[in-house]
Interface confidence: medium
Amino acid sequence: GITIPRNPGCPNSEDKNFPRTVMVNLNIHNRNTNTNPKRSSDYYNRSTSPWNLHRNEDPERYPSVIWEAKCRHLGCINADGNVDYHMNSVPIQQEILVLRREPPHCPNSFRLEKILVSVGCTCVTPIVHHVA
Amino acid sequence: GITIPRNPGCPNSEDKNFPRTVMVNLNIHNRNTNTNPKRSSDYYNRSTSPWNLHRNEDPERYPSVIWEAKCRHLGCINADGNVDYHMNSVPIQQEILVLRREPPHCPNSFRLEKILVSVGCTCVTPIVHHVA
């Protein structure tokens, strides 16, 4: 297993007043179907609003590595393979739950945290604001 | 507080052998930036690969209700507003963590679970398989 330098201020698991605290089994069960989601399509390249994936790492968080999408272009790729600036590539965002060690370096104490990640991009018609 | 019919098989929080079990503070911290990220983007309607949101419910899970994206068309919407079947609308999927009561009816014991959800759709060039 992993050895984590233990913080002397780690909360006592038996402290009944530890705020809104529960026991969580981290043997994470994967409810995904038998198809492997990791065969993560090459949509990021084939999309008319293609994106690159950037690595975000934080050892005090689970999962420690999160991949974030960044749209490659402001516009979208047209049938000729050129960028059409009459359309917009925009990120599709989603909140994900992660676990953060709290206090830091405590092996068995975490806080649930919500973070907003960009999952991919989609091509949208722009909203045009007409100036009087 | 809440009265939950208590399962006599609930794990003991003090059981040191309970597998990979940690204390988690469920006061969910929001790490999203100071600007409020919850913009009800109308991307689902403005996208060239529009989608609808469908309800998926499971009372033993938190969150119990998850709304999933389902692409409206097989093809993508072209500049004339018609569906172009030379392109494909495909779902962008992402794994999220949810909590499941385990064993069921134990008020303070949960298991983390990963599920795959569709967040939105993107328009991609199809892969054409040529038959010899």
Partner: antibody
């Protein structure tokens, strides 16, 4: 069809306590939140507090803190709201409302009140 | 607490007319803004959630828009059965709050 059925009308004296029930049927109970909202005669809606049965969490509006207690019993799919130290200002219709507490359009723990009870009329008078 | 201010307080409208009700929040609430309709002696009914999403069973003449601090509920082609009081409601921050209500009656 989801239904929230509340207990009947109450007449109370100042200083007394009140306990109203809200029984849920036709849908999951534990996965949702139940909030309590009141409406004084001719007035608007006022959120008092709520409970998330899945975790047993409660949240109360500061105005009612210390006077209101919200509980839930999963075995009977019933939520309760108890209000103590009643005064004539507590004369109102009290509603329970279901809060889906859902993962909506990419966001966790979003809230709205999709089903409401029929209301319980409470009169506080000496 | 987040204060929601609706305008107008009262509107008297002829059938088939377009009705617009606005709701302004005292701070940015993203899109955590919902609209309810309450008819006399009835419980409130959810019409629009998250600023712009219609809920099932709600006629298509009801629509919502806005985000941040400014929101609008529109009834395109008012019908007699739409008379009642309309409330906006924010769930971005505790305590959840409601607007003071806009009463719509039919001329």
């Amino acid at each position: 069809e989801v239904q929230l059925v509340q207990s009947g009308a109450e007449v109370k004296k100042p200083g007394e306590s009140l306990k109203i029930s809200c029984k849920a049927s036709g849908g999951s109970f534990k996965g949702y939140g139940i909030s309590w909202v009141r409406q004084a005669p001719g007035q608007g809606l006022e959120w008092m507090g709520g409970i998330t049965p899945f975790f047993g969490w409660t949240d109360y509006a500061q105005k009612f803190q210390g006077r209101v207690t919200i509980t839930a019993d999963e075995s009977t799919t019933t939520a309760y709201m108890e209000l103590s130290g009643l005064t004539s200002d507590d004369t109102a219709v009290y509603y329970c409302a279901r809060d889906p507490n859902e993962f909506w359009n990419g966001y966790y723990a979003t809230h709205d009140f999709d089903y409401w009870g029929q209301g319980t009329t409470v009169t506080v008078s000496s | 607490e987040i204060v929601l201010t609706q305008s107008p307080d009262f509107q008297s409208v002829t059938p088939k007319e377009k009705v617009t009700i606005t709701c302004r929040a005292s701070q940015d609430i993203g899109s955590d803004l919902h609209w309810y309709q309450q008819k006399p002696d009835q419980s409130p009914k959810l019409l629009i959630k998250y600023a712009s999403y219609s809920t099932s069973g709600v006629p298509s003449r009801f629509s919502g828009s806005g985000s941040g601090t400014d929101f609008t509920l529109t009834i395109n082609g008012l019908e007699a059965e739409d008379a009642g009081t309309y409330y906006c409601h924010q769930t971005d921050g505790l305590p959840y709050t409601f607007g003071q209500g806009t009463k719509v009656d039919i001329k």
